[in-house]
Interface confidence: low
């Protein structure tokens, strides 16, 4: 299994082609520092899947593992936060999926709702080899206490094997856990030995026990869920920033983006670009390029300002400041107008025009 690390240099190669990226909807994955995180790339069994973080290819490291369509980050740190992309290279074209990863203390214990590492959990048994239930992946069960902010999604897993294949049921505080016991019910992925509860509320607090049994025996494991009440919000961007700007060819310009966020935000500057003469792909999504993103050596103050030196006509267009945290994503946009040089440099700041 090859391993990849998270490289923190955040500058895109100039020759890298623009990609389509739907700003409003990248999946957001969250983890607490020290936890493991698994991201699923729905491009699936492509011949070659390459991964990038903030536009930079991921390099080898023993904390990050690529297994098929999954990127696993072990012992996550805040520096692992960022915009991840998986790209499937095909003979004719390529396709890319984007994910926001946020490593912060205030998060859900679970990963995404459709955990699909069932291949390692499903143990095929010889029909003659009878066996009582047993745990197949105790690593996924080590964290017994889960403190989760209200409204987050929680997943508890009890990967098991046995012959015949055991069944799984769940108890809450020692009693049968029924769908009607909570608003919205819950979801069980038997194939992956998981219980999923979305939008948890304080009444979901308690002990959750998986009971795995077949005719030769029974095993169980208990998790404790604590629901932490808070009023989360996605990043707030200061109104009017970034502001539209105009400058002459050869001049310098800067865009400023002020971000306010309780949860650790990840900030990026994105340029709307053209591909084959079009600003939008066939599915109506804009072509975008990540110009600047927070990295190891970048302070919050530095990332909040985008400098463009020695401006050319190609620099004209729409620029977007995008900020995401574990709660969601916000973005404001501004336009840069580039004027012919009249003989001396001139910089004008126009009225704000931003999206939200």
């Amino acid at each position: 299994r090859p391993s990849f690390s998270l490289v923190e240099d955040t500058t895109l190669e100039p020759e890298e082609p623009p990609t389509k990226y739907q700003i409003s909807q990248p999946e957001v994955y969250v983890a607490a520092p020290g936890e493991s995180l698994e991201v699923r790339c729905l491009l699936k069994d492509a011949a070659v899947i390459s991964w990038t973080k903030d536009g930079v290819h991921l390099g080898p490291n023993n904390r990050t593992v690529l297994i098929g369509e999954y990127l696993q980050i072990k012992g996550a740190t805040p520096r692992d936060s960022g915009l991840y992309a998986c790209t499937a290279s095909r003979t004719v074209d390529s396709e890319t999926w984007y994910f926001m990863v946020n490593v912060t203390d205030a998060i859900s214990s679970g990963d995404d709702e459709d955990d699909t590492d069932g291949a390692e959990d499903f143990v095929s048994e010889n029909s003659n080899n009878k066996r009582a239930p047993y745990w197949t992946n105790t690593e996924k069960m080590e964290k017994r206490l889960h403190a989760v902010p209200a409204a987050n999604t929680v997943k508890f897993r009890c990967p098991a094997g046995g012959n015949p294949m055991p069944t799984m049921r769940w108890l809450k505080n020692g009693k049968e856990f029924k769908q009607e016991h909570r608003i919205g019910g819950y979801k069980v992925r038997n194939q992956h030995w998981s219980l999923i509860m979305e939008s948890v509320v304080p009444s979901d607090k308690g002990n959750y026990t998986c009971v795995v049994e077949n005719e030769y025996g029974s095993i169980n494991h208990t998790y404790h869920l604590d629901v932490v009440e808070r009023s989360p919000h996605r990043p707030i961007l200061q109104a009017g920033l970034p502001a539209n700007a105009s400058t002459v060819v050869g001049g310098d310009v800067e865009f400023v983006c002020k971000v306010y966020s309780d949860a650790q935000p990840h900030i990026q500057w994105i340029k709307h670009v053209e591909k084959n003469g079009s600003k939008y792909g066939p599915d109506g999504l804009p072509y975008l390029k990540v110009l600047k993103a927070a990295g190891v050596n970048t302070t919050d103050k530095e990332i909040e300002v985008l400098y463009i030196r020695n401006v050319t006509f190609e620099d004209a267009g729409e620029y977007t400041c995008l900020a995401g945290n574990s709660i969601g994503i916000s973005f404001h946009s501004a336009w840069l107008t580039v004027l012919p040089a009249p003989g001396r440099e001139k910089e004008i700041t126009a009225s704000p025009d931003y999206l939200e």
Epitope: Q25, L42, A46, R90, Y98, T153, G184, L285, G328
Partner: antibody
Framework: MVQLQQSGPGLVKPSQTLSLTCAIS??????????WNWIRQSPGRGLEWLGR?????????DYAVSVKSRITINPDTSKNQFSLQLNSVTPEDTAVYYC??????????WGQGTLVTVSS | ELTQPPSVSVAPGQTARISCSGD??????ASWYQQKPGQAPVLVIY???DRPSGIPERFSGSNSGNTATLTISGTQAEDEADYYC???????????FGGGTKLTVL
């Protein structure tokens, strides 16, 4: 157990607006991991996804290109339901309309379906 | 665009296979739905090959290359229905369905 209950008129006149509602029980329209979809089925077109609404710290909508200019899907958190509005209908819009919940990328719960006929 | 055969026939107890083809479909996840007359579709396979709880083990799925396949082993009379495959477009914005296959149990 999640259940989706559809309601709305079965007959709409051409050029008017088709309006349907889908009431949710056993789940929340403001769920942070589900999406709420409208799908229609007609003999000529088969199953056709029309659009969805979903909440991820704010509300989002996606619509199929074929109806994008005419469709609106709105959530109603107070009643835990969501609605479909399709403007300027023609006989081509005659179909059985379904609401469905999706846990990307599949539709795991469906409403009972409503036959909507567009005719004068 | 997902393409399915309009009809498939199978004798009781035999294996029925319904195909669904689309450009590079194997690069995406396929789902399958069963629909009986006058009823809403029911999810029988998701993520290519996973079965929701309550769906009999005789239903299985696979997906590679340009073709996803729904396999019903030991087909029973109650399996007679229309079957639809479904997948998604780039970045999941649009969902697409196959045209449907009528399964007849002889």
């Amino acid at each position: 157990m999640v259940q989706l209950q559809q309601s709305g008129p079965g007959l709409v006149k051409p050029s008017q607006t088709l309006s349907l509602t889908c009431a949710i029980s056993g789940d929340s329209v403001s769920s942070n991991s589900a999406a709420w979809n409208w799908i229609r089925q007609s003999p000529g077109r088969g199953l056709e996804w029309l659009g969805r609404t979903y909440y991820r710290s704010k509300w989002y909508n996606d619509y199929a290109v074929s109806v994008k200019s005419r469709i609106t899907i709105n959530p109603d958190t107070s009643k835990n339901q969501f609605s479909l509005q399709l403007n300027s209908v023609t006989p081509e819009d005659t179909a059985v309309y379904y609401c469905a919940r999706s846990y990307y990328p599949d539709f795991d719960y469906w409403g009972q379906g409503t036959l909507v006929t567009v005719s004068s | 665009e997902l393409t399915q055969p309009p009809s498939v026939s199978v004798a009781p107890g035999q294996t029925a296979r319904i195909s669904c083809s689309g450009d590079a479909l194997g690069d995406k996840y396929a789902s399958w739905y069963q629909q009986k007359p006058g009823q809403a579709p029911v999810l029988v396979i998701y993520d290519d090959s996973d079965r929701p709880s309550g769906i009999p083990e005789r239903f299985s799925g696979s997906n590679s290359g340009n073709t996803a396949t729904l396999t019903i082993s030991g087909t029973q009379a109650e399996d007679e229905a229309d079957y639809y495959c479904q997948s998604y477009a780039s970045q999941g914005i649009h969902y697409v369905f196959g045209g449907g296959t009528k399964l007849t149990v002889l």
